[in-house]
Amino acid sequence: SQVSQNCHNGSYEISVLMMGNSAFAEPLKNLEDAVNEGLEIVRGRLQNAGLNVTVNATFMYSDGLIHNSGDCRSSTCEGLDLLRKISNAQRMGCVLIGPSCTYSTFQMYLDTELSYPMISAGSFGLSCDYKETLTRLMSPARKLMYFLVNFWKTNDLPFKTYSWSTSYVYKNGTETEDCFWYLNALEASVSYFSHELGFKVVLRQDKEFQDILMDHNRKSNVIIMCGGPEFLYKLKGDRAVAEDIVIILVDLFNDQYFEDNVTAPDYMKNVLVLTLSPGNSLLNSSFSRNLSPTKRDFALAYLNGILLFGHMLKIFLENGENITTPKFAHAFRNLTFEGYDGPVTLDDWGDVDSTMVLLYTSVDTKKYKVLLTYDTHVNKTYPVDMSPTFTWKNSKLPNDITGRGPQ
């Protein structure tokens, strides 16, 4: 039902849902610190623009008694319970920053009259695509899917001369929230990825994956999985791998590959790693100390959510426009704003755009090297290393189907 918003007369409030069930197991204190750091910046920016207004955040905690699994499985009801709490207290802000779980975001969007914007650090699933008042500040599954299709079709690079049309997808059900939805999107029979591929099989057992590595009758040389190098090692170990196998390891929120002293272990030589362009360093931040790379990105998304709200508030106030209107609720898209770590671009549907980076292991240096980058905003691939020192024959990626000649 409609809830009056604390969002007028020079006082603007942000409702931050602090949910026990979260896309990443991040202490809520760290997220609070991120929000507070963002608020300080927003206040400074508004003051600098000559706008003498108050901006605050209200942190809404769930009781944690019922919804305490800690992951996203019981998040659907937790999100709705928090909304009910807001409704009962008549304490809705101008914007809702919160649910990171796809389940909760989808249900909250469905079950409320959303006349206010919703900003999420997460909500990776396809079911949260194309939502008119939802903004997502971490790369959603749709963006990954578009990269993969683009890369599969590419056949005019010195190191990739074959179009691919097949793939195995390894998905065993123990994935993190981001990986779960990324792989879910690839698995879905109605998704763009499935539509564009001629053959795709999901491997659900460790043994299935392990058998494919040397199976002469395999239907594809390409296997997509999601996680870090350790996850791959647990699964693959030091098993022999056929020379034309290519493993695509999706590990978007991990910038450790770019650290100077990192050496790629031997088991990564058949692997291309897909990650995000580094830079989320948060070097001087009070909230970023002791955070893992993934959690840095999560906390950064909360901080950037605050900065995004400040950006939109500033624009609307400067134009003398009302904040509690559908126009404001629908405005958080198709724009670039100054984020904490640099410019942040949102697409027409309010989803963050980014530069994805595909890395390979150099057989010469045992270092991760950039093979190509992909700009999600323009859906375009940019080759970086035109003569990579691959493990694959002739320093070229193999065909996706063994024995099939040039196409």
């Epitope: 600098n48 360093s281 670039t336 770590d341 640099g342």
Partner: nanobody, 119 residues
Framework: EVQLVESGGGLVQPGGSLRLSCTSS????????MDWYRQAPGKQREIVAT???????TYSDAVKGRFTISRDNAKNTVYLQMNTLKPEDTAVYYC?????????????WGQGTQVTVSS
């Protein structure tokens, strides 16, 4: 009104070093990123280095490995340490801070400081 003041320019021999400073009376460096630009005679103004709120830095290819941008929030100052200077680094150096405008530059400029690299 935000004012930016550059200092530290001068004449230096090739291979030498200089440290430029950009100071503001406001808290602009705490709320926005900041860029150093330069403009050589008869040439377009070009970006040299950027420092974002997070402390992340980026550099143009021409100065990568030689120049370092840094910030001291307590002093409301951003620095550009320039090492191994070359004659082609000769230019007027400007600091640019604040919100990015439609033209992709930030809204506030300093008056510039001249750097001349010559033997």
């Amino acid at each position: 009104e935000v004012q930016l003041v550059e200092s530290g320019g001068g004449l230096v021999q090739p291979g030498g070093s200089l440290r430029l400073s950009c100071t503001s009376s406001s808290n602009i460096f705490k709320i926005y990123g900041m860029d150093w630009y330069r403009q050589a005679p008869g040439k377009q103004r070009e970006i040299v280095a950027t420092i974002y709120l997070s402390g992340r830095t980026t550099y143009s290819d021409a100065v990568k490995g030689r120049f370092t941008i840094s910030r001291d929030n307590a002093k409301n100052t951003v620095y550009l340490q320039m090492n191994t200077l070359k004659p082609e680094d000769t230019a007027v150096y400007y600091c640019n801070a604040g919100e990015t405008t439609a033209s992709s530059v930030r809204q506030y400029w300093g008056q510039g400081t001249q750097v001349t690299v010559s033997s």
